[in-house]
Amino acid sequence: GELETSDLVTVVLGQDAKLPCFYRGDPDEQVGQVAWARVDPNEGTRELALLHSKYGLHVSPAYEDRVEQPPPPRDPLDGSILLRNAVQADEGEYECRVSTFPAGSFQARMRLRVLVPPLPSLNPGPPLEEGQGLTLAASCTAEGSPAPSVTWDTEVKGTQSSRSFKHSRSAAVTSEFHLVPSRSMNGQPLTCVVSHPGLLQDQRITHTLQVAFLAEASVRGLEDQNLWHVGREGATLKCLSEGQPPPKYNWTRLDGPLPSGVRVKGDTLGFPPLTTEHSGVYVCHVSNELSSRASQVTVEVLADPEDPGKQVDLVSAS
């Protein structure tokens, strides 16, 4: 017969380590007992537990409440044990000694390695503004044992750079994502992806990009000058811009105060029935925390327009 085991066992910090020791023998062979010990620098070996075919499991005081047999169903030839709630101090070598009848004794050693999974953190960089050069968008840090892998998942064009710092049996990895900010990046996700053998799946932390910008301002409403005639109702000027943070709008008249009855509602300037007094230069002011813009238009209210609406009515009435 022979022992089936593994010379390297890996467990995640805080989880249960299965230390395998299975006797593969002839059908008439029996396992009397399995003695488990830790190979110790001082005492040579330190007993963990004894599995007896007749008397069951006996755990040494130093490992009380920490050593169990795997859950049933159990094979009588299986001498494996569970070391519960593994800590880094459990790293080292373990030995199982199997006493069989009639084949005699067998022993095997294995190494236990404890993985420490990372707890990643994402830190956004300084505020992003359109017009900046290459700027730090975010950094992501993860520390684990062994070293974790830190990468970025995003549609945004940019450059990744990472640095790592080793301690004894662990490493801290920091990856930075740099980009040239543009308004098209606004609201785009930037995801830090951390891989580690102690994680069941990659850990992902998403940061939504905010790029401050303010577009040039323009005014809509004067496309057809013929519509700006005395008596027209519902005439409006709309200021067009775009920004992050969303901009605030303000209207002024270059050559004096706004005429009475002219109302400002956000980005729109609303006129009462037009008179020639509404003629003038109007300025739309757009601003946010980043910048301010302005656009001006000249309104000329026509005194004696040809009224195409009335002409149509006359034709239809004749």
Epitope: G92, E93, P146, S149, V150, S164, K166, S195, H196
Partner: antibody, heavy 116, light 108 residues
Framework: QVQLVQSGAEVKKPGASVKVSCKAS????????IHWVRQAPGQGLEWMGW????????NYAQKFQGRVTMTRDTSISTAYMELSRLRSDDTAVYYC?????????WGQGTLVTVSS | EIVLTQSPGTLSLSPGERATLSCRTS???????LAWYQQKPGQAPRLLIY???NRATGIPDRFSGSGSGTDFTLTISRLEPEDFAVYYC?????????FGQGTKVEIK
Amino acid sequence: QVQLVQSGAEVKKPGASVKVSCKASGYTFTGYYIHWVRQAPGQGLEWMGWINPNSGGTNYAQKFQGRVTMTRDTSISTAYMELSRLRSDDTAVYYCAREDWDFDYWGQGTLVTVSS
Amino acid sequence: EIVLTQSPGTLSLSPGERATLSCRTSQSVSSSYLAWYQQKPGQAPRLLIYGASNRATGIPDRFSGSGSGTDFTLTISRLEPEDFAVYYCQQYGSSPITFGQGTKVEIK
């Protein structure tokens, strides 16, 4: 700074044994496993096994089981690798390396020549 | 055991060029368990990259590692004269620890 200094070159006859030493300095010797790797002339790297300087526990590659013995002396921070029943194809440079998951520090190597 | 296959066997390039070295593993390997080493004639190997993508202390940033699963890559962005050497990948996640057979980067 971390250093692993190995013993000098050896010439051995087939069937003999060789014992190579690896003295560690600049760190706590018992805090890291020591591995042994060999490299035949013009060939790649071949892992032989490890020793835990803290416990004395060892693990050998199957190819070398029964022929290799790794030991340590913690009082002088030195690891040893003994290879017995030498054959001509054991001619190689033997390296010790410190394990920090990967092998972050290596000895300078010891050339062992097996020749009749 | 996990077999590591490196390609190409030899890479002939000029200083200033970009070198891309491949390492394929016979079974999936966690990126945390993959390293790259550089070895020059008559010298011991030197750790370049650990955890597939992390540069070891003192390694210039022209060296970078990437990959996951069974496909890993070492890239040297602009070859310097001192970069011409043999490069080995290694997995240390399962026993036995294994190395690739090496890629020699030589001057064209």
